[in-house]
């Protein structure tokens, strides 16, 4: 069972000292975080019992392991059902507090109540102030049951519940019909999943048989120790004050657990600690009596003394629950109460024993669940014991559950119940995960959800490449961490699997399925250079770069050219498909920006150095096109170009620049300033005759602007070859800009 | 669905003695109170008699008191109202009816048995 | 007391609303919250329509509203309509753990 504990502070005098406290002896426990499960949880739980609201509860969590819940303001806020969550996974346990008003009409004699399929229960409500009216019994919140106030025996109405079973498990309460339900008296009721002394599915299995007054759980077989004992049987008496299944934890205060109610896991429920009794867990043990709610009687025997917290305190010479055993009759020593061995492995179990006549080799045996008896192969006989090793045949998963160590003597006989744990090695349920991969290297999570049992103590990593027949390699890593692949092959598939351990000898898991990764391209290791770059326009840039000179096939698929706008923090990328490639054209550009440039080559997805960067300046956007672009020939060699200013100009025109190209021919565009930027007519001089150009134009202020249209026209036939064409403005001669 | 259904009423003499049974289903006939009430003809309904769940607790009119005994059989299902004693002004329609679980006031109702008590 | 006290008739027309009154003592309707209604059709079995004072059960009609004041409970119908026309009776859990019902009124729908 899950080492869960509900504790509440029953100094009812001010409801703004009660306290709940919940404490969990689970490793991990409350942490919260994905390794170790959820936190715990402490809630009042008001789907049954509603109470008017209130200021919220207060809940303070004290290191990883415990939480209060405090801000109890009056003592309406304490009535009801409060609940404690714990554990993780499968393991999650909900344990339950439910609380009495002192002041009630009707008072529990007994809140929890825990009895067997099959059983009948019985729950007494105490009458405390009377009402002459009928009496309402309530099952989780719902009409149970009526009894005329008549009908009470002794001062108790009682609710008979024949043959229960564990549907009728839950919160139970009889009300006076006219009185506040905060005045009922509530009770819980747990009816274990089998009859009385079995467990397992179909109750089939034999309870350890739990001793002062644990309870058998009906899941697992596990004894749910009362507060104070501990040991796989609640055998063994925890020092006063202490409490955890390992006794391990300690009433806060200086007066120990008084006043403390202790709420642990179903099939237990709630009750004091060991040695106090009372509604409010005040009053001590009478003479005689010992353990949680002083349910238990000690009946010493041979001079021994009754302590009220662990029970016979006996003389030298005796032992045993009542002090019944002579230290002569042989007595099992030092037997562990729980055992954990993985499947199919054959174990060695160690029981030794003492006793007067000395007990020999063959009068210790050890008997399986099933009834099976083993004789020990091998005794190590020593002055105060014998010590009978067990060589146990192949464990299988029946094999869990309770053995015992029996041994007998003409002095008497002794046994001792412990459980064994069988647990099934892991086997990953999926492939481990690639994280990510370089050319020679993988990264890779290994821990994947698994069947069996954990925990997971190691985790091996197997891999080889694909297809390949040779061994496989071998990693060996911690469970919580990623792992990395080194040294392997670039631009090759490796199968990967997953192989997990769980602590003890054959713990080992069968590998988990194979997942194909497979690892990158070589890096590109080549660093280009930019070798210029110019200006095409206010938006465009052409740029060209070089590769060092070395021996061998160019290790790469293209260039990837970064522009970097520093003002606007915006980078623009542009991808050069081919390794052959040595200048690009970059458009569509923010005019007027400045530019870190750099280029680098890729292969695959990896990405080479990145060259030296350049700083570029774009030019501001220039103004709008000039309109109305009309060319008419003058003579075999001359031209002229009329056309009208651009509108909503951003400034003064500096000039235009005209581009002269021959119609069709492969040849470079010409390029002419216009240096008047008055004038809206220009001729261009010395073109060849009969021959058809393109003519566009376009304005600059600070940056050359958009194009105007183009236009075409013919020079007149028959004349000389001239040496090029020229402009001329109002007879003004201008040379050209190429 | 809740059903109640009564039965045993006939012509009875004065001074005579008749009981009345309800068979019910449909709810858990054993966790709820019970009552009878009748209706002499022409006339307003009158509460006769109520019995716990357990059978241990009883109540009577006035009227009736020391004459009627109101009892169950939990194992049938079964309400009975045994009458002795019958007057003229016991005629009436007898109806068997359930109490609401955890208050005053009857949800279900039988069609009713009619008693008449003549000479 | 036997009985609870009503009116034996309230009639009104359609779409009107009245009220019927019943009227008991501090050991009836005055000491507790559990008067309820019941309407009764020529010749059939009583129907609850109002239980614990004000409440009603799932089906009823929310035109049929009950209220208490002091010793004297009341229901109103409101919108009234042809086949509001019944007996009705109010009853009331008493101090000796016992029910008493009232004499009943006969509502006509004019």
């Known amino acids: 069972a899950v080492d869960l504990t509900l504790l509440a502070n029953l100094r009812l005098t001010d409801p703004q000292r009660f306290f709940l406290t919940c404490v969990s002896g689970e490793a991990g426990a409350g942490r919260g975080s994905d390794a170790w499960g959820p936190p715990l949880l402490l809630e009042k739980d008001d789907r049954i019992v509603r109470t008017p609201p209130g200021p919220p509860l207060r809940l303070a969590r004290n290191g990883s392991h415990q939480v209060t819940l405090r801000g109890f303001s009056k003592p309406s806020d304490l009535v009801g059902v409060f609940s404690c969550v714990g554990g993780a996974g499968a393991r999650r346990t909900r344990v339950i507090y439910v609380h009495n008003s002192p002041g009630a009409h009707l008072l529990p004699d007994k809140v929890t109540h825990t009895v067997n399929k099959g059983d009948t229960a019985v729950l007494s409500a105490r009458v405390h102030k009377e009402k002459q009216t009928d009496v309402i019994w309530k099952s989780n919140g719902s009409y149970f049951y009526t009894l005329d106030w008549h009908e009470a025996q002794d001062g108790r109405f009682l609710l008979q519940l024949p043959n229960v079973q564990p549907p009728s498990s839950g919160i139970y309460s009889a009300t006076y019909l006219e009185a506040s339900p905060l005045g009922s008296a509530f009770f819980r009721l747990i009816v274990r999943g089998c009859g009385a002394g079995r467990w397992g599915p179909g109750c089939t299995k034999e309870c350890p048989g739990c001793l002062h007054g644990g309870v058998c759980h009906d899941h697992d077989g596990e004894c749910v120790c009362p507060p104070g004992f501990t040991g796989t049987r609640c055998e063994q008496a925890c020092r006063e004050g202490r409490f955890g299944q390992s006794c391990q934890e300690q009433c806060p205060g200086i007066s120990g657990c008084r006043g403390l109610t202790f709420c642990l896991p179903d099939p237990y429920g709630c009750s004091c600690g060991s040695g106090w009794r009372g509604s409010q867990c005040q009053e001590a043990c009478a003479p005689g009596h010992f353990g949680a709610d002083c349910r238990l009687q000690c009946q010493c025997q041979n001079g021994g003394t009754c302590d009220r917290f662990s029970g016979c305190v006996c003389p030298s010479g005796w032992h045993g629950v009542h002090c019944e055993k002579s230290d002569r009759i042989p007595q099992i020593l030092n037997m562990a109460s729980e055992l954990e061995f993985n499947l199919e492995t054959m174990p060695r179990i160690n029981c030794a024993a003492a006793g007067n006549p000395f007990p020999v080799r063959g009068s210790i045996e050890l008997r399986k669940p099933d009834g099976t008896v083993l004789l020990s192969t091998k005794a190590i006989v020593e002055p105060e014991k014998t010590t009978a090793e067990f060589e146990v045949p192949r464990l299988v998963l029946a094999d869990s559950g309770f053995w015992e160590c029996r041994v007998s003597t003409s002095g008497g006989q002794d046994s001792r119940r412990f459980k064994v744990n069988v647990k099934v090695p892991p086997v990953p349920l999926a492939a481990p995960r690639l994280l990510t991969k370089q050319s020679r290297q993988l990264v890779v999570s290994p821990l994947v959800s698994f069947s069996g049992d954990g925990p997971i103590s190691t985790v091996r990593l197997h891999y080889r490449p694909q297809d390949s027949t040779m061994d496989w390699s071998t990693i060996v890593v911690d469970p919580s961490e990623n792992v990395t692949l080194m040294n392997l092959r670039p631009k090759t598939g490796y199968s990967v699997r997953v192989q997990l351990s769980r602590p003890g000898e054959g713990g080992e898991g069968a590998w988990g399925p194979p997942t194909l990764m497979t690892t990158d391209c070589p890096e590109p290791l080549l660093q280009p250079w930019l070798e210029g770059w110019h200006v095409e326009g206010t938006d465009r840039l052409r740029v060209s770069w070089s590769l060092p000179l070395v021996p061998g096939p160019l290790v790469g698929d293209g260039f990837l050219l970064r522009l970097w706008d520093g003002t606007r923090g915006q980078e623009r990328r542009e991808n050069v498909s081919s390794p052959q490639a040595r200048t690009a054209l970059l458009t569509g550009l923010t005019p007027g920006t400045h530019y870190q440039l750099d280029v680098q080559l890729y292969h695959c997805t990896l990405l080479g150095p990145a060259s030296p960067p350049a700083h570029v300046l774009l030019p501001p956007s220039g103004p709008p096109a000039p309109r109305h672009l009309h060319a008419q020939a003058l003579s075999d060699s001359e031209i002229q170009l009329t056309w009208k200013h651009p509108e909503a100009l951003p400034g003064p025109i500096s000039k235009y620049v005209v581009e002269v190209q021959v119609a069709g021919g492969a040849g470079d565009p010409l390029w002419i300033d216009v240096d008047r930027p008055e004038e809206t007519s220009t001729i261009i001089r010395g073109l060849n005759a009969s021959t058809r150009y393109l003519f566009r134009m376009r304005a600059s202020i600070q940056g050359l602007g958009d194009w105007s249209n183009t236009v075409e026209e013919s020079t007149l036939g028959n004349g000389l070859q001239a040496e090029g064409p020229v402009q001329e403005s109002r007879a003004a001669e201008e040379g050209l800009d190429q | 669905e809740v059903q109640l259904l009564e039965s045993g009423g006939g012509l009875v003499q004065p001074g005579g003695s008749l009981r009345l049974s309800c068979a019910a289903s449909g709810f858990t006939f054993s966790a709820y109170v019970m009552s009878w009430v009748r209706q002499a003809p022409g006339k307003g309904l009158e509460w006769v008699s109520r019995i716990y769940p357990s059978g241990g607790g009883t109540r009577y009119a006035d009227s009736v008191k020391g004459r009627f005994t109101i009892s169950r059989d939990n194992s049938k299902n079964t309400l009975y109202l045994q009458m002795n004693s019958l007057r003229a002004e016991d005629t009436a329609v007898y109806y068997c009816?359930?109490?609401?679980?955890?208050?005053?006031?009857?949800?279900?109702w039988g069609q009713g048995t009619l008693v008449t008590v003549s000479s | 007391q036997s009985e609870l006290t009503q009116p034996a008739s309230v009639s009104g027309s359609p779409g009107q609303s009245i009220t019927i009154s019943c009227t008991g003592t501090?050991?009836?309707?005055?000491?507790?919250?559990?008067v309820s209604w019941y309407q009764q059709d020529p010749g059939k079995v009583p129907k609850l329509i109002i239980y614990e004072v004000y409440n009603r059960p799932s089906g009823v009609s929310n035109r049929f509203s009950g209220s208490k004041s002091g010793n004297t409970a009341s229901l109103t119908i409101s919108g009234l309509r042809a086949e509001d026309e019944a007996d009705y009776y109010c009853s009331s859990k008493t101090s000796s753990v016992t029910y008493v019902f009232g004499t009943g009124t006969k509502v006509t729908v004019l």
């Open positions: 501090t050991s009836d309707v005055g000491g507790y919250n559990y």
């Open positions: 009816a359930k109490e609401a679980g955890g208050s005053y006031f009857l949800d279900y």
